[in-house]
C-alpha cells in the first residue's frame, strides 16, 4: 500500500534570464528511494538522481541545469519557453512510484519585479 | 583504457553458492558504478545489481534476497555471490562499469563474460 | 519491472541499405534509452545512450530516435562490420531492463 506523500514548492514564478529552484519531499513513507527523476511539461527528462550513484544530467540541458539542493533541481538562464509543467518522479521500493507537480511561470524580469514587490511574505 | 576480467569455476552445484570476481585495470573502483549483469541461455540481458563508488550497493529486487557485491579497493576488484543457485542461474555473467554522470543507466565498458553452468 | 519489446527478432538487409530496429517500451521511459552491439563471441558495446546521443567513437551511421515508449535504432548504411544482436535498454527506474535483441545480418 502506497502511504507516501510528495510536498512541492507548487507554483512558483521567476525571472527570465534568472535561476529557479525545484524542489520536491516525499514523507510518511518507509520506503526506499532508488531513483528521483526530473521531467519537463513536454515529458522530456531534465535529470536523474539514483540514490546510490549520484546525478545524471541529460546532455541537452547540461548547460542549464544544476544539480540540489538536496534531490531537487536548480534551472539558470530562464527562458519564457521554460514556462510550465515541472514532475518530480520518486521510484521507491517496495512503493511504486510518486509523482510531484510543479507549475513555473517565466516572467519578463519587469513584471516579475512588480510581482515581487507586492508579495506576501 | 578501462579493462575487466571475470574470474570464478565455470561450474557450481544446485543449491551451492556461485562466487565471482572481476579485476579491474586502467581505472579505480572508487569512481562509478561497478556492475553485474547476466544472460541466461536464449534469453534476456538481466540486471543482477551493482556497488558505487562509495560502496553503496542496489540488487535487482527479484534476486535481491540471494545476491551480494561486494569490493576490495586495495585489489582493485569487485566479487558477486550468488547462494541457493539452481538450473536457472545457469548464464554468461558480464562485469560491467557505469559512468552514471555521463551516461545515466548506459553501460560504458563490459568484460569478456564468463559462463556458469549449474548442474550436478 | 518495465518490459522491453524489440522487433523485429531478425533482420536481413543488403550491404548499403537501411536497418532499422524497433524497441516499444512497456511504459512511458521519456529519452532514457541506450541501445548495445554485440558482435559473435564478443560483449556488448554502447552505441547510443539518452535515446539519441551516439557514444564515443560510434560511426555517425548509427542513430538513435524516440521518446516515451517508442524507440529506434537506425543503421542509415549497413557494413559488413555491423553485423550483430542489437539491444535496447532502459534506465528510466530501477530495475534497469534490456530488450530481447535483433539479430542483424546481410541479405
Known amino acids: 500500500m502506497m502511504t507516501g506523500t510528495i510536498e512541492t514548492t507548487g507554483n512558483i514564478s521567476a525571472k527570465k534570464g534568472g535561476s529557479v529552484i525545484l524542489q520536491c519531499h516525499l514523507s510518511s513513507t518507509m520506503a526506499q528511494v532508488t531513483q528521483v527523476n526530473w521531467e519537463q511539461h513536454d515529458h522530456s527528462l531534465l535529470a536523474i538522481r539514483n540514490a546510490e550513484l549520484g546525478w545524471h544530467i541529460y546532455p541537452a540541458f547540461k548547460d542549464r541545469v544544476a544539480p540540489g539542493p538536496g534531490l531537487g533541481l536548480t534551472l539558470q538562464s530562464l527562458t519564457m519557453n521554460d514556462t510550465g509543467e515541472y514532475f518530480c518522479t520518486y521510484h521507491t521500493y517496495p512503493d511504486g512510484t510518486y509523482r510531484g507537480r510543479i507549475f513555473l511561470e517565466v516572467l519578463e524580469s519587469s513584471v516579475a519585479e512588480h510581482s515581487a514587490r507586492f508579495q506576501i511574505p | 583504457e578501462v579493462q575487466l576480467q571475470e574470474s570464478g569455476p565455470g561450474l557450481v552445484k544446485p543449491s551451492e553458492t556461485l562466487s565471482l570476481t572481476c579485476a579491474v585495470s586502467?581505472?579505480?573502483?572508487?569512481?562509478?558504478?561497478w556492475n553485474w549483469i547476466r544472460q541466461p541461455p536464449g534469453k534476456k540481458l538481466e540486471w543482477i545489481g551493482y556497488i558505487s563508488y562509495s560502496g553503496n550497493t542496489y540488487y535487482n529486487p527479484s534476486l535481491k534476497s540471494r545476491v551480494t557485491i561486494s569490493r576490495d579497493t586495495s585489489k582493485n576488484q569487485f566479487s558477486l555471490k550468488l547462494s541457493s543457485v539452481t538450473a536457472a542461474d545457469t548464464a554468461v555473467y558480464y562485469c560491467?562499469?557505469?559512468?552514471?554522470?555521463?551516461?545515466?543507466?548506459?553501460?560504458?565498458?563490459w568484460g569478456q563474460g564468463t559462463t556458469v553452468t549449474v548442474s550436478s | 519491472d518495465i518490459v522491453m519489446t524489440q522487433s523485429p527478432d531478425s533482420l536481413a538487409v543488403s550491404l548499403g541499405e537501411r536497418a532499422t530496429i524497433n524497441c516499444k517500451a512497456s511504459?512511458?521511459?521519456?529519452?532514457?534509452v541506450a541501445w548495445y552491439q554485440q558482435k559473435p563471441g564478443q560483449s556488448p558495446k554502447l552505441m547510443i545512450y539518452s535515446a539519441s546521443y551516439r557514444y564515443t567513437g560510434v560511426p555517425d551511421r548509427f542513430s538513435g530516435s524516440g521518446s516515451g515508449t517508442d524507440f529506434t535504432l537506425t543503421i542509415s548504411s549497413l557494413q559488413a562490420e555491423d553485423v550483430a544482436v542489437y539491444y535496447c535498454q532502459q534506465y528510466y527506474t530501477t530495475p534497469w531492463t534490456f530488450g530481447g535483441g535483433t539479430k542483424v545480418e546481410i541479405k
Open positions: 511504459q512511458n521511459v521519456r529519452t532514457a
Open positions: 586502467g581505472y579505480s573502483i572508487t569512481s562509478d558504478s
Open positions: 560491467a562499469r557505469l559512468d552514471f554522470s555521463n551516461y545515466g543507466g548506459a553501460v560504458d565498458y
